[in-house]
């Protein structure tokens, strides 16, 4: 906490310029008006205030606005957004993407913190779902951003969001994700011809049902054995032979080295052994 | 991709002067800070200076204080460090390295080398 | 200007161990202070920023803690790739400042 001390004379600020790096803290405390700090915060990034100096800054914001900043504040903090904490930032209200990307630019670079978290959070709260335009910008920013939401929030992903999707970022879902994310992205894609499709869905098949995968074996999709082994274990089991034969293409010869892993191993105790040497692999049932 | 590539390092003799470029790549460095960090042979790090570009903010160690300057081009997006009165003790690699606080990204470093 | 002063210099550890250094400031630097590693002929890496913040890319088994003057970088499980030397740095007032730097060998 800053002590309330009189500004020296000659002292007063008249505007958010340089000259206030070389100002104490206490007499930053004393001789800016926290009102001409929330009219000119667009000027602060400009200026190379002290890590020190920031916390003065925020000290006469939080004064300012109790009940947490305006939109017109938050859109310039820049670097005074990392002394924010996860409890100054539920008190805003964000519903500017520009706000939202000029915010996350700052933090650009890492890993995602609590109070990074705290701002998405409130922005999609604020917007009722995520919309394209922000999981463009989420996942540009935070790669596996997607898969840090619960199966519940990912529910409010409209489908047309799922075009904005690239593979890198369901690295991280886990497969109740996927059964929540799979169906949109079956929705979303199912305008596009077989090889295209496929290209589109692989990455989302961690959630297909098995009729969708029977499917797909009809049509020389060649799935890649990391593919099938990111597959639901409950979607695999009621596959035939043939029908994995066909699904895999030339990489079933893959399946000899993932013998012991699930779902092959699951999957193979499951077939007769006349049907599983017609692979000629020497997989044993 | 962010990239920091210094020059100009080499042999001086002690009061002699050098000009180190370091040109900037991936990002504007009018909307960065840059500075100079060095590192003597078998020591740790030392900060030289820095210039935030916008308003031609410049800052200085002690041990460089009127002796050193830092400027910055941001046409070129490039920053420079002129050393003039160089010592022995200057004898160092120098980093140019990006960040307003905390320095996200360095160049590969500059050898100078301060003797007779 | 403020100190930084890192301990131990230098340290011997093998690999799988858990690895603390410490870095003390010469007064109050609040969160404002970050880790660097550097190996041989190279130039220093950011891993920490924000006395916690892991920078992209940093394995989670580095950790930073600490507020004030006592700051902690915790490698939790060393690998082969982490013998290095370690640096602080507070950027709380100008001139920023490093820590002698911390060297961590094979044991």
């Known amino acids: 906490e800053v002590e309330k001390t009189a500004c020296p004379s000659g002292k007063k600020a008249r505007e958010i310029d340089e000259s206030l790096i070389f100002y104490k803290k206490w007499e930053l405390e004393a001789c800016v008006d926290a009102a001409l700090l929330a009219t000119q915060m667009d000027r602060v990034n400009a200026i190379p205030f002290t890590y020190e100096q920031l916390d003065v800054l925020k000290h006469k914001l939080d004064e300012l606005y109790p009940q947490g900043y305006p939109e017109s504040v938050i859109q310039h903090l820049g670097y005074l957004f990392l002394k924010m904490s996860p409890e100054d930032i539920r008190k805003w209200n964000v519903t500017s993407l520009e706000t939202l990307k000029a915010l996350l630019e700052v933090n650009k670079g890492h890993e995602m913190s609590p109070q990074v978290a705290t701002l998405i959070d409130r922005f999609v709260k604020g917007r009722g779902q995520l919309d394209k335009d922000t999981l463009d910008t989420l996942t540009a920013f935070y790669p596996g951003y997607l898969c840090s939401l619960s199966p519940e929030e990912l529910s409010s992903v409209p489908p047309s969001s799922i075009w904005a999707v690239r593979p890198q970022d369901l690295d991280t879902c886990d497969p109740r994700q996927l059964d929540v994310l799979y169906p949109k992205a079956r929705l979303a894609f199912q305008n596009m011809n077989g090889s295209e499709y496929f290209v589109k869905i692989q990455s989302f098949l961690g959630g297909a049902p098995t009729e969708d995968l029977k499917a797909l074996s009809q049509q020389n999709v060649s799935m890649d054995l990391a593919t099938f082994m990111k597959l639901r274990t409950d979607a695999v089991l009621p596959l035939t032979v043939a029908e994995v034969q066909k699904l895999l293409g030339p990489h079933v010869e893959g399946l000899k080295a993932e013998e012991r892993h699930r779902p092959v191993r699951d999957w193979i105790l499951r077939q007769r052994q006349d049907d599983l040497d017609t692979l000629g692999l020497g997989l044993q049932g | 991709e962010v990239q920091l590539v210094e020059s100009g390092g080499g042999l001086v003799q002690p009061g002699g002067s050098l000009r180190l470029s370091c040109a900037a790549s991936?990002?504007?460095?009018?909307?960065?800070?840059i500075h100079w960090v060095r590192q003597a042979p078998g020591k740790g790090l030392e900060w030289v200076a820095s210039?935030?570009?916008?308003?031609?903010?410049?800052t200085y160690a002690d041990s460089v204080k009127g002796r050193f300057t830092i400027s910055a081009d941001t046409s070129k997006n490039t920053a420079y460090l002129q050393m003039n009165s160089l010592r022995a003790e200057d004898t160092a690699v120098y980093y140019c390295?990006?960040?307003?606080?905390?320095?996200?990204?360095w160049g590969q470093g500059t050898l100078v080398t301060v003797s007779s | 200007d403020i100190q930084m002063t890192q301990s131990p210099s230098s340290l011997s550890a093998s690999v799988g161990d858990r690895v603390t250094i410490t870095c003390r400031a010469s007064?109050?630097?609040?969160?404002?202070v970050a880790w660097y590693q550097q190996k041989p002929g190279k130039a220093p890496k950011l891993l920490i920023d924000?006395?916690?913040r892991l920078y992209s890319g940093v394995p989670s088994r580095f950790s930073g803690s600490g507020s004030g003057t006592d700051f902690t970088l915790t490698i939790s499980s060393l690998q082969p790739e982490d013998f290095a030397t370690y640096y602080c740095?507070?950027?709380?007032?100008?001139?920023?400042?490093f820590g002698q730097g911390t060297k961590v060998e094979i044991k």
């Open positions: 390295a990006r960040g307003r606080y905390w320095l996200d990204y």
């Open positions: 991936g990002f504007t460095i009018s909307k960065a800070s």
């Open positions: 210039i935030w570009p916008t308003k031609g903010f410049t």
């Open positions: 007064q109050d630097v609040k969160e404002g």
């Open positions: 924000e006395r916690e």
């Open positions: 740095q507070q950027y709380n007032t100008w001139p920023a400042t």
